[in-house]
Interface confidence: medium
């Protein structure tokens, strides 16, 4: 709305950079072929670029990431009863950003 | 995968908090009856609750809120020329969080 | 105070019955798995019972699968272990103790124990 | 049924570093607890999910597990660390507990 303009602050700008975001670890990345299973713990911290950029042409994107092995439970349901086991996800921490210039495929003449 | 055990440390729930995540400022939260103009910035910083609970039957929820009025250039197109204008945009900032009982419905017998 | 207090225990012969009650206070009990461990005089800890955080999940250490039952009733806060058909072998101190988590995991708070004695 | 072994007992000087073992088949594909049992009391947990600690539980605990071999150690051992020590792993269906290492301050 345009009112109440005097109680408002300026907006500030969400600038392209890392920020910690939560991760939910779906049973797939653990196993495709078996779904009688939970995953412990369901979500963890990632650190991912977000935020925008100075102008409409650009993006904001991860410019260095890292992959994370991280150890979780599979618990396998057995007749009723559970099975615990590890596994490991990996997850993608982004590490630096930078504000990239989208390029669009021309259409071919 | 089961396998690369040793690296990997413990994966950490993450947990039911406020964190800041990036809100895009869309145009129709300005006015709805015109699609002919810019909003700067295009998105904002605000606090959000997020993460996951200990229990299966709770959810990570808002317990606490605030409105934040912020202002937002509108950059309306009028004859291939901008013309700057002021409007406002109310944010909602989580303040605090809880884990709530999911209530499912029970089916009217 | 974060605490479990268990208390039914006692000298009962070869043959009998006893109830175990563990009462919980100072946390959503209802959001935590639960499990008995006992000790023999003089032994080392042994897993006897697990009940998950709904009461749904239930299981059995060997010895005991046939003659004990494992049950909860979260709107008193009160996990039970009801003893049928006892032996001399089952004399221990008896702990209920927390999951931290709906599905088990490590016993992150114990009671102080109570003593059930099988004895002619 | 799976079974976890500890050896009986350590011992280890005030300052030095306790190690105590806790052995089973495939034991690394499971996440070990160690618990702290003091005379006439009940047990701590003093390690979980293989290295992690508890707060309120010292830094000079510390745990490890890989292989067929879980190993609680204690750096810069103290008096007040005399006590039974017992491992514990949920594996098929039950939760298992090792037959305890007594531990012994010289």
């Known amino acids: 709305s345009l009112g109440s303009l005097a109680a408002a602050e300026p907006a500030v700008i969400a600038e392209c950079k890392t920020r910690t975001e939560v991760f939910q670890i779906s049973r797939n990345l653990i196993d495709r072929t078996n779904a009688n299973f939970l995953v412990w713990p369901p979500c963890v911290e990632v650190q991912r670029c977000s935020g925008c950029c100075n102008n409409r042409n650009v993006q904001c994107r991860a410019s260095q990431v890292q992959m994370r092995p991280v150890q979780v439970r599979k618990i396998e349901i057995v007749r009723k009863k559970p099975i615990f086991k590890k596994a490991t996800v990996t997850l993608e921490d982004h590490l630096a950003c930078k504000c990239e210039t989208i390029v669009t495929p021309r259409p071919v003449t | 995968s089961l396998g690369s055990l040793a690296a990997a440390e413990p994966a950490v729930i993450a947990e039911c908090k406020t964190r800041t995540e990036v809100f895009q400022i869309s145009r129709n939260l300005i006015d709805r009856t015109n699609a002919n103009f810019l909003v700067w910035p295009p998105c904002v910083e605000v606090q959000r609750c997020s993460g996951c609970c200990n229990n299966r039957n709770v959810q990570c929820r808002a317990s606490q809120v605030q409105m934040r009025p912020v202002q937002v250039r509108k950059i309306e197109i009028v004859r291939k020329k901008p013309i700057f204008k002021k409007a406002t945009v109310t944010l909602e900032d989580h303040l605090a969080c809880k884990c709530e009982t999911i209530v499912t419905p029970r089916p009217v017998t | 105070e974060v605490q479990l207090v268990e208390s039914g225990g006692g000298l009962v012969q070869p043959g009998g019955s006893l109830r175990l009650s563990c009462a919980a206070s100072g946390f959503t009990f209802s959001s935590y798995a639960m499990s008995w461990v006992r000790q023999a005089p003089g032994k080392g800890l042994e897993w006897v019972s697990y009940?998950?955080?709904?009461?749904?999940?239930?299981y059995y250490a060997d010895s005991v699968k046939g003659r004990f039952t494992i049950s909860r009733d979260n709107s008193k806060n009160t996990l039970y272990l009801q003893m049928n058909s006892l032996r001399a072998e089952d004399t221990a101190v008896y702990y209920c103790?927390?999951?931290?988590?709906?599905?088990?995991?490590?016993?992150?708070?114990w009671g102080q124990g109570t003593l059930v004695t099988v004895s002619s | 049924s799976y079974e976890l072994t500890q050896p009986p007992s350590v011992s280890v000087a005030p300052g030095q570093t306790a190690r105590i073992s806790c052995s089973g088949d495939s034991l690394g594909s499971y996440f070990v607890h160690w618990y702290q049992q003091k005379p006439g009391q009940a047990p701590v947990l003093v390690i979980y999910d293989d290295s992690n600690r508890p707060s309120g539980i010292p830094e000079r605990f510390s745990g490890s597990n890989s292989g067929n071999t879980a190993t609680l150690t204690i750096s810069g051992t103290q008096a007040e660390d005399e006590a039974d020590y017992y491992c514990s792993a949920f594996t098929h269906n039950s939760d298992v507990f090792g037959g305890g290492t007594k531990l012994t301050v010289l």
């Open positions: 103790a927390r999951h931290p988590y709906w599905y088990g995991g490590q016993l992150d708070l």
């Open positions: 009940i998950s955080d709904d009461g749904s999940l239930k």
